[in-house]
């Protein structure tokens, strides 16, 4: 992987209405099941097709869920977090943290594998080459005048 990887963190309130098959996503994490090292937070591991979350479109795999109906998810056992979602009722308000991967400029949503940002040199080299060609063509044109 080339370049330094930074993250742009944004928070969003997502209100979901429980559909016929529920909220439609999976979670990982908790104090007994750390998904991210040194972080016992609750993360979205999968969004089910045609579920309430997928149809809403805002919740993404890899998002961290900070609270459910105003209840903080900090320092919860994994199963306690699952039970909190299951008992959250028909209208569910999620406070969510999106982490957007920023690698030397380009932005892409964080997935589970290696980050796939474009290395900066792959952008700069063609731009530099085009600039040189344009400068050379301009100089030749001026000489002909």
């Amino acid at each position: 992987m080339n370049g330094r990887v930074d993250y742009l963190v944004t928070e969003e309130e997502i209100n979901l209405t429980r559909g016929p098959s529920g909220l439609g996503f999976n979670i990982v994490g908790g104090t007994d099941q750390q998904y991210v090292s040194n972080d016992s937070g609750i993360y979205v591991s999968r969004i089910k097709e045609n579920g309430a979350a997928a149809l809403d479109g805002r919740l993404q795999e890899g998002d961290k869920i900070l609270s459910v109906n105003g209840q903080d998810l900090k320092n919860l056992l994994h199963q306690d977090a699952v039970d909190l979602f299951r008992n959250a009722g028909y209208a569910v308000s999620l406070r969510v943290q999106h982490r957007l991967q920023v690698q030397n400029g380009p932005i892409g949503h964080r997935g589970e594998g290696d980050p796939s940002g474009i290395p900066i040199f792959m952008v700069l080299v063609p731009v530099f080459a085009l600039t040189m060609v344009a400068a050379w063509a301009f100089m030749r044109y001026r000489q002909q005048l």
């Epitope: 529920g22 979670i27 089910k48 994994h78 199963q79 299951r86």
Partner: nanobody, 127 residues
Framework: HVQLVESGGRLVQAGDSLKLSCAAS????????MGWFRQAPGKEREFVAG????????NYGDSVKGRFSISRDNARNTMYLQMNSLKPEDTAVYFC?????????????????????WGQGTQVTVS
Amino acid sequence: HVQLVESGGRLVQAGDSLKLSCAASGRTFSTYTMGWFRQAPGKEREFVAGTSPSGDNRNYGDSVKGRFSISRDNARNTMYLQMNSLKPEDTAVYFCAAFRGSCVDYGCDFRVSQYDYWGQGTQVTVS
């Protein structure tokens, strides 16, 4: 990703006991919900039993409650199904299945469609 391999299936007599095993590859076994399903010839795949990532929560299909017991050993990356008081109607191919994390909806871990990873199956025949 996780790869699953079942073992332990064989021919037994009615009333006998049998223990199935499901060995999983991968370092993150303890973050997967695991389940056992079975499929008899000409029938749909049926939920038998499921266990939460930690093993604390266990669910059973109505036809096996009180007779079958699911367990897991996260240190060994293995799940088990202890089957007691076997009946001829328990005859089927038994599949081990898994999905990452826990689903946040009641009853979701009973659904075949919830599971992403499947073993090849092991045949159990009760005569």
